[in-house]
Amino acid sequence: MMTGTIETTGNISAEKGGSIILQCHLSSTTAQVTQVNWEQQDQLLAICNADLGWHISPSFKDRVAPGPGLGLTLQSLTVNDTGEYFCIYHTYPDGTYTGRIFLEVLESSVAEHGARFQIPIEGRDYKDDDDKHHHHHH
């Protein structure tokens, strides 16, 4: 039974040209995290593998930095970075948990600082079924 929940930074806004930290936290489970995938819509941004370390997708190599922790730092933000981001936690023995973050990149005069809040997102909708695509779970 999957008991864990994913807490995320929720809906966040940031300034164009600035940077932002995408952060998820898995709690209420003793499952071992084996890999975390960070995705934007259907595009892979990065992988953090417990055994092998980080992989940053080449199309983001100049603008994405690993960390802090299992999080991801997006730099040199553009308006095109606005959208949904997903942290997909692969765990053993629980299976897969998915968290969602919505990022809005605004012109610097409009962006609100400190507009971060946490939305717990439960990851109980599916088990470790490799044939299912994570984005079916919003």
Partner: antibody, heavy 121, light 106 residues
Framework: EVQLVESGGGLVKPGGSLRLSCAAS????????MSWVRQAPGKGLEWVGR??????????DYAAPVKGRFTISRDDSKDTLYLLMNSLKTEDTAVYYC????????????WGQGTLVTVSS | SYELTQPPSVSVSPGQTASITCSGD??????GCWYQQKPGQSPILVIY???KRPSGIPERFSGSNSGNTATLTISGTQAMDEADYYC?????????FGGGTKLTVL
């Protein structure tokens, strides 16, 4: 020590089929993205296709010349990669290598010796 | 289809610096990798993710990738570096190899 051992090559007639295997050891195979690369006699390297880890969807990508004819699969419980080749053509004659995609700093390794596939009537 | 272009051959004197280029449309948006292959042997990865060296590869091998060009640089080239070198464009959807460059150490 990372090791890849390819097998299953041989002589096959045009239009025939062959299945290659690659036995992996010395690393966590299930997390690796794996590719097949071939090299025709006296020619350069040509990427055939890849399969991602199950934790990245386990999806496959193929080069245009083999798409629809070749199928890559993996058995993580056996640490083995496969390449099923159907409708073989003479131009598929090559040494076939299985390789680890260079995703992670902690997982780069040597290629195997390859297995020779000869398509001839 | 995506293509990578390498010079067929490059010559260098021992101790000098050899540079092998690889060009492709927006190659800098992908990862550039380089492989060394000596006659009768399997290829060896010498540079991955543009500029990283696998363990066991000498420091004289370095790489860069920007714009439309990736470059493999061998400083203080040695006779043992004579080989074919292949560039590779890598991303999460496809992989492409260049045609190869024969490096001759005069």
């Amino acid at each position: 020590e990372v090791q890849l051992v390819e097998s299953g090559g041989g002589l096959v007639k045009p239009g025939g089929s062959l299945r290659l295997s690659c036995a992996a050891s010395g690393f966590t195979f299930s997390y690796a993205w794996m590719s097949w690369v071939r090299q025709a006699p006296g020619k350069g390297l040509e990427w055939v296709g890849r399969i991602k880890s199950k934790t990245n969807g386990g999806t496959t990508d193929y080069a245009a010349p083999v798409k629809g004819r070749f199928t890559i699969s993996r058995d993580d419980s056996k640490d083995t990669l496969y390449l099923l080749m159907n409708s073989l053509k003479t131009e598929d004659t090559a040494v076939y290598y299985c390789t680890i995609d260079p995703l992670y700093d902690l997982l780069t390794g040597p290629w195997g010796q390859g297995t020779l596939v000869t398509v001839s009537s | 289809s995506y293509e990578l272009t390498q010079p067929p051959s490059v010559s260098v004197s021992p101790g000098q610096t050899a540079s092998i280029t690889c060009s492709g449309d927006k190659l800098g948006d992908k990862y550039g990798c380089w492989y060394q292959q000596k006659p009768g042997q399997s290829p060896i990865l010498v540079i991955y993710q543009d500029s990283k060296r696998p363990s066991g590869i000498p420091e004289r091998f370095s790489g860069s990738n920007s714009g439309n060009t990736a470059t493999l640089t061998i400083s203080g080239t040695q006779a043992m570096d004579e080989a074919d070198y292949y560039c590779q464009a890598w991303d999460s959807s496809t992989v492409v190899f260049g045609g190869g460059t024969k490096l001759t150490v005069l």
